[in-house]
C-alpha cells in the first residue's frame, strides 16, 4: 500500500473578518495510527491551532467526526476570523508513539488571508487658520485593512485633487495595513463653504468607498476690507461716519473708533449679515457733531479680526467745509446704530 499523504488542496483561503475559515485536509490512508494536529507557521516557533487528541480550542470545530475509525477528513473551521489569524496553516499527521507521538507527515500548507475593511477615513486640517492664496495641508488616515491594495483620492467640492502624497504601511507583509495621505490645497476667498473629501476604495467595500470630510470653514480666514464713508444727516452740524467691514470670516471681530488717535469706542461684531459665499459684512457708524470743532478731525476705524494684527482705515473730517458736500453717499445698512457726539 502507498505511504500516507496529507493533502491540503487549497494554497489559499480568503475570508472576511468576522467570518469562519474552512481549512481543508485529508489523509490518503488510515495507517499509521495517530492523531492530526493543526499548526500556524512552521518550525520550532509554530503555534498549535488544534490537537485531535487533547486540549480546548473554542474557536475550532472539525468538519467531520474525527472519532469515527475510518475518518480521513481532518478539515477544520475557525470562527470569528480577525486579521491576526492570517498566516500559513499546516495539517500534520502524527504516528502513535511512546511516550510521545512522533510527527510523521505534513501537508503543503494553506495560507489564510483575511479581508478586513478600512476604518472610516479621518481628515484633519492645519492647526492654525490661513488666508486665501495660501497653501494648506490636509491629512487623511485609515487603518486596519487587508489586503494591502487600496485606492485613495482627494476632492475639493467634487473636483479631484492631484497634489498629494500617500503611504501605505508597513511596506512588507502584515496582517493589516494603514494608509496616510497628505494633500495640498490652495485657499480662495470663496472657500468658506468648501469641503475637502478623502475617499478610500478597497476590495472589502464592494464599490462603495468610505469618505472623510473636512470643512474649509475650520481652516480659512478671510480678512475684511474696510471702507470709511461720510454722509450728511438732517441737522446741518452733524455728520454720519460709517465703517463698512466687508467679506470677512470667521465672525470674530472687534472694531475700535479713534478720534485723532484717541480711542473713542470699541465694539464687537454681533448683528452681521451673511453673504452667499459664507463671508460676513458688518457696519458701524458714528454721529459726529462738528459745530464744536475748530480743527479737522481724523477718524480711524480700526479692526482686529480673529486675533490678527489690527487693520485700519482713516477718514479726515474737514470742519471748515460744508458737511453736505463731503463724503460719498453710500446707503447705510441697518446692522448697527451707534452715536457719538463730539463737543
Amino acid at each position: 500500500e502507498e505511504e500516507l499523504q496529507v493533502i491540503q488542496p487549497d494554497k489559499s483561503v480568503l475570508v472576511a473578518a468576522g467570518e469562519t475559515a474552512t481549512l481543508r485536509c485529508t489523509a490518503t490512508s488510515l495507517i499509521p495510527v495517530g492523531p492530526i494536529q493543526w499548526f500556524r507557521g512552521a518550525g520550532p516557533g509554530r503555534e498549535l491551532i488544534y490537537n485531535q487528541k487533547e486540549g480546548h480550542f473554542p474557536r475550532v470545530t472539525t468538519v467531520s467526526d474525527l472519532t469515527k475509525r475510518n475518518n480521513m477528513d481532518f478539515s477544520i473551521r475557525i470562527g470569528n476570523i480577525t486579521p491576526a489569524d492570517a498566516g500559513t496553516y499546516y495539517c500534520v499527521k502524527f504516528r502513535k508513539g511512546s511516550p510521545d507521538d512522533v510527527e510523521f507527515k505534513s501537508g503543503a500548507g494553506t495560507e489564510l488571508s483575511v479581508r478586513a475593511k478600512p476604518s472610516a477615513p479621518v481628515v484633519s486640517g492645519p492647526a492654525a487658520r490661513a488666508t486665501p492664496q495660501h497653501t494648506v495641508s490636509f491629512t487623511c488616515e485609515s487603518h486596519g485593512f487587508s489586503p494591502r491594495d487600496i485606492t485613495l483620492k482627494w476632492f475639493k467640492n467634487g473636483n479631484e485633487l492631484s497634489d498629494f502624497q500617500t503611504n501605505v504601511d508597513p511596506v512588507g507583509e502584515s496582517v493589516s495595513y494603514s494608509i496616510h495621505s497628505t494633500a495640498k490645497v490652495v485657499l480662495t476667498r470663496e472657500d468658506v463653504h468648501s469641503q475637502v473629501i478623502c475617499e478610500v476604495a478597497h476590495v472589502t467595500l464592494q464599490g462603495d468607498p468610505l469618505r472623510g470630510t473636512a470643512n474649509l470653514s475650520e481652516t480659512i480666514r478671510v480678512p475684511p476690507t474696510l471702507e470709511v464713508t461720510q454722509q450728511p444727516v438732517r441737522a446741518e452740524n452733524q455728520v454720519n461716519v460709517t465703517c463698512q467691514v466687508r467679506k470677512f470670516y470667521p465672525q470674530r471681530l472687534q472694531l475700535t473708533w479713534l478720534e485723532n488717535g484717541n480711542v473713542s469706542r470699541t465694539e464687537t461684531a454681533s448683528t452681521v449679515t451673511e453673504n452667499k459665499d459664507g463671508t460676513y459684512n458688518w457696519m458701524s457708524w458714528l454721529l459726529v457733531n462738528v459745530s464744536a470743532h475748530r480743527d479737522d478731525v481724523k477718524l480711524t476705524c480700526q479692526v482686529e479680526h480673529d486675533g490678527q494684527p489690527a487693520v485700519s482705515k482713516s477718514h479726515d473730517l474737514k470742519v471748515s467745509a460744508h458737511p453736505k458736500e463731503q463724503g460719498s453717499n453710500t446707503a447705510a445698512e441697518n446692522t448697527g446704530s451707534n452715536e457719538r457726539n463730539i463737543y
Partner: antibody, heavy 118, light 108 residues
Framework: DVQLVESGGGVVRPGESLRLSCAAS????????MSWVRQGPGEGLEWVAG????????WYADSVKGRFTISRDNSKNTLYLRLFSLRTEDTAIYYC???????????WGLGTLVTVSS | EIVLTQSPGTLSLSPGETATLSCRAS??????LAWYQQKPGQAPRLLIY???SRATGIPDRFSGSGSGTDFTLTISSLQSEDFAVYYC??????????FGGGTKVEIK
C-alpha cells in the same frame, strides 16, 4: 479585461539561469493564486509551479523542484519564475495562468519561449 | 500523482457532427476536473470546470459530464472554430496539478 503578459524568455545554455515575469492587469492580483504552466514543442501541457495569494505557500512539479522558484510581488501585480540549472528538457513555452478558487486556470497569458540549447 | 488518460488521441470529424472526448483519472478526483481548448499558436482557453460547469462566454454546444474517474466532453454540432486540441486537468487534490495528454479534433 484580464490580461497576463509574460516576458523574460530567451535562449540559454544548459546549467544557466533565467527569470520570467508575468505582468497582470484587469483584476485584483492579490485575490488570486497564480501558476506557471509549460508546453514543450509539439507536446501537451505541464503544470510547473503555483503560489498562494501572499506567497506563503508554493507548489512545484517534481520535475522542477529545487531548480525553479515561483514568487510574486503584489505591489507590482507581477508573478515571477526563476529557472536555475536549466536542462534541454526545460525548453518550452511558459504560460502564466490565473487560478480560480479551486486551482483550475480561468485566464492564460500568451506565453514566453524558453530555449535551452548547447 | 494522479494520471489523466485522454482518448482518443485524435478524432476526425466533419462540421455539424458531435465530438465525444474521454478523460480517465487514475484516482477518484470527485468533480474536480476542467477542460481546455487550445488552437495552434494560442494559449489554452477554459471551457468547463467542476466537470460540468461552462466557463463564461462558452457556447452551450460544449458540455461536460462525469465524476470520480470517468469524464466526458461533448461538442455537439461541430463548428469550424472548434477544431483544436482539448485537454482535461484535475485539481482539488493538492500538488501536483496534472493534465491529460490531449485529444486533437481535426476536420475529416
Amino acid at each position: 479585461d484580464v490580461q497576463l503578459v509574460e516576458s523574460g524568455g530567451g535562449v540559454v545554455r544548459p546549467g544557466e539561469s533565467l527569470r520570467l515575469s508575468c505582468a497582470a492587469s484587469g483584476f485584483t492580483f492579490s485575490d488570486h493564486d497564480m501558476s506557471w504552466v509549460r508546453q514543450g514543442p509539439g507536446e501537451g501541457l505541464e503544470w510547473v509551479a503555483g503560489i498562494s495569494l501572499r506567497g506563503g505557500v508554493t507548489w512545484y512539479a517534481d520535475s522542477v523542484k529545487g531548480r525553479f522558484t515561483i514568487s510574486r510581488d503584489n505591489s507590482k501585480n507581477t508573478l515571477y519564475l526563476r529557472l536555475f540549472s536549466l536542462r534541454t528538457e526545460d525548453t518550452a513555452i511558459y504560460y502564466c495562468a490565473r487560478e480560480s478558487w479551486n486551482t483550475f486556470f480561468d485566464y492564460w497569458g500568451l506565453g514566453t519561449l524558453v530555449t535551452v540549447s548547447s | 500523482e494522479i494520471v489523466l488518460t485522454q482518448s482518443p488521441g485524435t478524432l476526425s470529424l466533419s462540421p455539424g457532427e458531435t465530438a465525444t472526448l474521454s478523460c480517465r483519472a487514475s484516482q477518484n478526483v470527485r468533480s474536480n476536473l476542467a477542460w481546455y481548448q487550445q488552437k495552434p499558436g494560442q494559449a489554452p482557453r477554459l471551457l468547463i470546470y467542476d466537470a460540468s460547469s461552462r466557463a463564461t462566454g462558452i457556447p452551450d454546444r460544449f458540455s461536460g459530464s462525469g465524476s470520480g474517474t470517468d469524464f466526458t466532453l461533448t461538442i455537439s454540432s461541430l463548428q469550424s472554430e472548434d477544431f483544436a486540441v482539448y485537454y482535461c486537468q484535475q485539481y482539488g487534490n493538492g500538488p501536483p496539478l496534472t493534465f491529460g495528454g490531449g485529444t486533437k479534433v481535426e476536420i475529416k
